[in-house]
Amino acid sequence: QNCSGPCRCPAEQAPRCPAGVSLVLDGCGCCRVCAKQLGELCTERDPCDPHKGLFCDFGSPANRKIGVCTAKDGAPCIFGGTVYRSGESFQSSCKYQCTCLDGAVGCMPLCSMDVRLPSPDCPFPRRVKLPGKCCEEWVCDEPKDQTVVGPALAAYRLEDTFGPDPTMIRANCLVQTTEWSACSKTCGMGISTRVTNDNASCRLEKQSRLCMVRPCEADLEENIKKGKKCIRTPKISKPIKFELSGCTSVKTYRAKFCGVCTDGRCCTPHRTTTLPVEFKCPDGEVMKKNMMFIKTCACHYNCPGDNDIFESLYYRKMYGDMA
């Protein structure tokens, strides 16, 4: 992890890197390694891809152990096969306005994510896609016997699936915070990012947090009850410690993770919160990292790799996270 010890490289000559990933000398000048890519975790030994203008952002001067590969100021973004300049805004579809900032794309919904609570006039509120309309709209399913134009007497439990409005006005600054992106890993420790100008200078900045949708070692399919197709949020029996590049969380956590389905759906975080986690490293150094904690998960067909890149990301976004 650090360069104080002697050089020790794997027996095989050089690793085979995936297409588009550079083979570089590690940060200690010892071994050839596959360079870490945008948004991946990096260390002194695991450098970021210099050919893509990436550097290891450790977040704070105190923490020099583990960082996130970040694009240098002004780096462009590649989104849906198109290159955008840093600072450039574009519409990825009729639903989203996106901004490229130093290699990271943050998108704001153009469609209202407004909630509708049941009322006598609309006991069964639903958001539906209407022909010829880009944004989903609220419709109220009427009870069979309702013919009047006034209210209907029925009750209905609407799941609170729509998160808070991410925009607000503050002292000459339209505060805009994009949703947290989906976790970069479907299992194990990954990174989730967002773009915000919620700061004193009202300048766009990137924020990142660690995330773990589920542990890689868990065989969750075994726990699916007979006749069921999904296990949305499996019960975690014992508190766990998180591991991050050889460092271990100081506290133990009874964290929730998302389950799996056997019918092609994927289960992803639905409501989350962000909390700081302290990690202690073998050399005694302690570092603090923000981490996503899952409150609830949702199982759906909008899985990674669907046609609209952002659509699949967006429907897997983290609702209701104000941190």
């Epitope: 909630v115 009322s119 006039d121 609309c122 134009v149 009750a155 439990r157």
Partner: antibody, heavy 114, light 110 residues
């Protein structure tokens, strides 16, 4: 962003008619109903009337003969008229969106005095 | 005339749990009354917290929950925070009209 804003006279003379307008944005009056509620100084909230998304109306029976609620969906406005005003009608008048009374206007204070 | 009654005031310590209730003078409150809970913090506008008995608005923290309890509508706050100090009103629907309760002034000690 959902907003509701009440407007109307600050001072009304007894026996006169009060006309209040609620101008909404961020949602359509064809999708959500709008309620009028008032709060006399130091007292509790009092529900007055509602115009539902499809144009139906309901009123507080205690005021039914004095109240009329209407809307202009294209202008995103809901209008409440209250006839024969009396000093006891002095209050802050609010409009609120239907569906859990989730969004409210800031209110407009109306004083009834000669 | 239908009357909706709330506790005039309640006091709770930070981190504690408190239940505000909303009683109807004409019988048990049911889901057809679409119980709503509205909050007003000092110097701020009203905003809805709960609609349709138990549905939270997007800004309503999970520590707030709406339910029916012993024939009354109830708003339970678990793990009360100092910022929960406010006036809380319930509103019940009676086929043709809503009736608001008198409001509960919730004080958070400390």
């Amino acid at each position: 962003e959902v907003t509701l804003k009440e407007s109307g006279p600050v001072l009304v003379k007894p026996t006169e008619t009060l006309t209040l307008t609620c101008t909404v944005s961020g949602f359509s009056l064809s999708t959500f109903g709008v309620h009028w509620i008032r709060q006399p100084p130091g007292k509790a909230l009092e529900w007055l009337a509602v115009i539902w998304r499809r144009g139906g109306t309901d009123y507080n029976a205690a005021f039914m003969s004095r109240l009329t609620i209407s809307k202009d969906t294209s202008k995103s406005q809901v209008v409440l008229t209250m006839t024969n005003m009396d000093p006891v009608d002095t209050a802050t008048y609010y409009c609120a969106r239907d569906g859990g009374f989730d969004y409210w206007g800031q209110g407009t204070t109306v004083t009834v005095s000669s | 005339e239908t009357v909706v009654t709330q506790e005039p005031s309640l006091t709770v310590s930070p981190g504690g749990t408190v239940t505000l209730t909303c009683r109807s003078s004409i019988g048990a409150v049911t889901t057809s009354n679409y119980a709503n809970w509205v909050q007003q913090k000092p110097g701020q506008a009203f905003r809805g917290l709960i609609g349709g008995t138990s549905n939270r608005a997007p800004w309503t923290p999970a520590r707030f929950s709406g339910s029916l309890l012993g024939g009354k509508a109830a708003l339970t706050l678990s793990g009360v925070q100092p910022e929960d100090e406010a006036e809380y009103y319930c509103a019940l629907w009676y086929s043709t009209h809503y009736v608001f309760g008198g409001g509960t002034k919730l004080t958070v000690l400390g």
